[in-house]
């Protein structure tokens, strides 16, 4: 199996009540605007065939995509939560910048690509869905990276 290195976040990142609350409030506001309840972006399918030791690397890819392709372009919306949460998630992304996998990561990229394709196919409603799942992103990062 591929070896992942530097794929760790300190648990203190996930033990800050204020920013955790803001992240969940942002997700809640966006999910109220999400009328496509049939599709789930962050779920069992995302982790299919990915070992526990590789999951932080996978979540790093999802986090970077969410920031660059969803949150930054949509960052004028869902105030005041967005302007508080984006720097926090950008900080987590920065802390995972040295998280790499030695070896083949094609199976991980395939799963992440499916998520990306789903968001792109749904257009703006896909972006809103991704924001609405920030609580799941937060929890998945926590479970995979600490």
């Amino acid at each position: 199996a591929p070896i992942s290195s530097h794929c760790r976040l300190d648990k203190s990142n996930f033990q800050q009540p204020y920013i955790t609350n803001r992240t969940f409030m942002l997700a809640k506001e966006a999910s109220l605007a999400d009328n496509n309840t049939d599709v789930r972006l962050i779920g069992e399918k995302l982790f299919h065939g990915v070992s526990m030791s590789e999951r932080c690397y996978l979540m790093k890819q999802v986090l970077n995509f969410t920031l660059e392709e969803v949150l930054f372009p949509q960052s004028d919306r869902f105030q005041p939560y967005m302007q508080e949460v984006v720097p926090f998630l950008a900080r987590l992304s920065n802390r995972l910048s040295t998280c790499h996998i030695e070896g083949d990561d094609l199976h991980i990229q395939r799963n992440v690509q499916k998520l990306k394709d789903t968001v792109k196919k749904l257009g703006e409603s896909g972006e809103i869905k991704a924001i609405g799942e920030l609580d799941l992103l937060f929890m998945s990062l926590r479970n995979a990276c600490i």
């Epitope: 990142n13 800050q16 204020y18 920013i19 609350n21 803001r22 930054f72 372009p73 960052s75 004028d76 105030q79 005041p80 302007q83 508080e84 984006v86 720097p87 926090f88 950008a90 900080r91």
Partner: antibody, heavy 120, light 111 residues
Framework: QVQLVQSGAEKKPGASVKVSCKAS????????MHWVRQAPGQGLEWVGW????????FYAQKFRGRVTMTRDTSINTAYMELSRLGSDDTAVYYC??????????????WGRGTMVTVSS | QAVLTQPSSVSGAPRQRVTISCTGS?????????VHWYQQLPGTAPKLLIY???NRPSGVPDRFSGSKSGTSASLAITGLQAEDEADYYC???????????FGTGTQLTVL
């Protein structure tokens, strides 16, 4: 370290003024930039914000129609332009980066302020 | 214009406890977005003192604390010191205006 450096004092006869705020020490596009003003001996007044990533700006109702906030990401600088100046626009204008409300570096970074004096 | 109302001035002797109130409405404090407090020492830029009702940024002494109830918030300072003499402002998101609003400001005098 994180720093905001503002342009120097301005004395204006009443047309318009453009104040600059150069950011350093952090990723400019990750944090909203707010503008706040304070007239001599008065309280703080929120003018608006700009999102440096999108360039989208939002202004307090009082200033809509005569304030414009822009940014130049190539030089990490935010600008605030106020037009149709009146004597009651005489104030110190501050830029302030959206505070981090997480981690051990929580706090807000402010510029030192630009004094704008409107006089005929 | 939505306003967050504060007493114009409060005073206290060294080592005493003082509180500064901030009264709003259902569109700002009552909407539950979280109240922030700023301290402005004479001739300087404001400094974030409390965020999200009761959280202290690193470096802010635990003599400063914040609380919120209904449409009002308050800042408490215990063990008052000469260097606490400053102006204090509450700051909040106002949902009706879709923007931030500062309180009217309170001047604290240490006797």
């Amino acid at each position: 370290q994180v720093q905001l450096v503002q342009s120097g004092a301005e004395k204006k006869p009443g047309a318009s003024v453009k104040v600059s705020c150069k950011a350093s020490g952090y990723t400019f596009t990750d944090y909203y930039m707010h503008w706040v003003r304070q007239a001599p001996g008065q309280g703080l007044e929120w003018v608006g914000w700009i999102n440096p990533y999108t360039g989208g700006a939002f202004y307090a109702q009082k200033f809509r129609g005569r304030v414009t906030m822009t940014r130049d990401t190539s030089i990490n600088t935010a600008y605030m332009e106020l037009s149709r100046l009146g004597s009651d626009d005489t104030a110190v204008y501050y830029c302030a980066r959206e505070p981090e409300r997480f981690g051990d570096s929580t706090g807000q970074v402010w510029g030192r302020g630009t004094m704008v004096t409107v006089s005929s | 214009q939505a306003v967050l109302t504060q007493p114009s001035s409060v005073s206290g002797a060294p080592r005493q406890r003082v509180t500064i109130s901030c009264t709003g409405s259902s569109s700002n404090i009552g909407a539950g977005y979280g109240v922030h407090w700023y301290q402005q020492l004479p001739g300087t830029a404001p400094k974030l003192l409390i965020y999200g009702n009761s959280n202290r940024p690193s470096g802010v002494p635990d003599r400063f604390s914040g609380s919120k109830s209904g449409t009002s918030a308050s800042l408490a300072i215990t063990g008052l010191q000469a260097e606490d003499e400053a102006d204090y402002y509450c700051y909040h998101w106002d949902k009706e205006q879709s923007g931030y609003v500062f309180g009217t400001g309170t001047q604290l005098t240490v006797l």
